[in-house]
Interface confidence: low
Amino acid sequence: EVEKTACPSGKKAREIDESLIFYKKWELEACVDAALLATQMDRVNAIPFTYEQLDVLKHKLDELYPQGYPESVIQHLGYLFLKMSPEDIRKWNVTSLETLKALLEVNKGHEMSPQVATLIDRFVKGRGQLDKDTLDTLTAFYPGYLCSLSPEELSSVPPSSIWAVRPQDLDTCDPRQLDVLYPKARLAFQNMNGSEYFVKIQSFLGGAPTEDLKALSQQNVSMDLATFMKLRTDAVLPLTVAEVQKLLGPHVEGLKAEERHRPVRDWILRQRQDDLDTLGLGLQGGIPNGYLVLDLSMQEALS
C-alpha cells in the first residue's frame, strides 16, 4: 500500500506525459489525479512506465472504480491489462469487440493467461453466444480456443459461426467436442455442392455418424487417411468394405499401414476376411469364411 503523502510543489500532473517516467512511486500516487488518468489512459500505453509504476497507476484506477472499470478505460488499458487479476476482470462489463481485440493484442504471442480466459468468458457471457465475429477474433489470436470449450459451452455456438472455423482450430478437439460441432457444421454447409461441401466438413467429421459416412462414400470424396483415423470408431464399424473403399478412393491403400491402429483395427475385426481380401492389401484379422456374424448391438437392444 502506497502511503498518502502530499504532492511536492510544482509536481502536480496536468496531463499524462513522459515527465511522469521520472516520478517515484509515492510521487505518482500523490501527484496524479485518478480522473485525469482515466481520461488519458490512451497515453499511458505509449509511455515506457516501469511495471512498478504501472502498479501505482492501477491502484489509482482501482480506487476510482471500486465496482470495476468502465469500458472507455478498459479499451485503453494496453500493457496495464497484464497487471489485472482475474478478480479485477470479473467486475468488468466488456461489450465491444474492439475492446476485446485491443486487450488480446497486448497478450499476443503468449499462452492464454488466466486474465485472458476470464476476459473472454466475461465477453462471451455478455453477448449470450459465440457469434461469428467473436469466434473469428478469438481463433485468430488463439487457434486452440474452440477446443478449450466444454461441449456445453460449444452448444451456444450458432451454425453461422462455423464459417469462421479453420481446420487448425479443431486440431486439439476431442470426440465429445466434435459431436457438438459436427451437426452445426452440417447445417452451416448444407447448401454447398459435393466437393466444396466435403472440403468444408472434413475437419468436423470426427463427430459424424455412420449414416453420414455412408452418404459420403457415394460421392467420390477420396477421404485421406488422416481424416479417416479421426473418425468415431462406433461410426466406422458398421461400414462395409465396399463403402470404405469408396470413401477412401485411391487412399484405401493406406489402410495397410494403419491396420494395427483404431479405428482400422476394430473395423477389420468386424469384416469378413473374404471381403477384406478383395482390397488386395493383405489386411488380416477379419472373420473367417463360414463363421456367423452376430450383430452384438442388435442383440443388446433385444435383451
Epitope: N45, A46, P48, T50, Y51, E52, G78, Y79, E105
Partner: nanobody
Framework: EVQLVESGGGSVQAGGSLKISCAAS????????MGWYRHITEKERKLVAT???????YYADSVKGRFTISRDNAKYTVYLQMNSLKPEDTAMYYC??????????????WGQGTQVTVSS
C-alpha cells in the same frame, strides 16, 4: 543482465539527417519499452522518443514530425531517424531499455551514449 550498444552518432549541418541505432544483447527477453534520451547537461536528462513492446511510440514535442523511432524486435534493436536537425538537437543521446523484472532502484538499462553535434 542486458547490454546496450549505441552507434551512428556524428556531426551534421543544420537541416541534415542522422540515424542512430541501439542494439541490445544478453537477457533480451527481459526488455519492455525502449527509448532515446538526451543529456544536454550532466543533470538534465530529457526523453526524446520511446517505443513500447507493442510498437506504440511517443515523442517529445520538440522533435515531433522530425524524428522517427522504430524497433526491430527480431534483432532487439531500436533506431532513431533524425531529420531536419537543429543546433539545439546537439547532445549526447542515450539508449534506455526497460527492465520488466524491475524490483530494485533502477528500472532501466542504459547504453554508453552516442554524441550528435549539429552545427549552424
Amino acid at each position: 543482465e542486458v547490454q546496450l550498444v549505441e552507434s551512428g552518432g556524428g556531426s551534421v549541418q543544420a537541416g541534415g539527417s542522422l540515424k542512430i541505432s541501439c542494439a541490445a544483447s544478453g537477457s533480451v527477453i527481459d526488455i519492455g519499452a525502449m527509448g532515446w534520451y538526451r543529456h544536454i547537461t550532466e543533470k538534465e536528462r530529457k526523453l526524446v522518443a520511446t517505443i513500447n513492446a507493442g510498437g506504440n511510440t511517443y515523442y517529445a514535442d520538440s522533435v515531433k514530425g522530425r524524428f522517427t523511432i522504430s524497433r526491430d524486435n527480431a534483432k532487439y534493436t531500436v533506431y532513431l531517424q533524425m531529420n531536419s536537425l537543429k543546433p539545439e538537437d546537439t547532445a549526447m543521446y542515450y539508449c534506455a531499455a526497460e527492465d520488466i523484472n524491475y524490483t530494485g532502484t533502477e528500472a532501466y538499462y542504459w547504453g554508453q551514449g552516442t554524441q550528435v553535434t549539429v552545427s549552424s
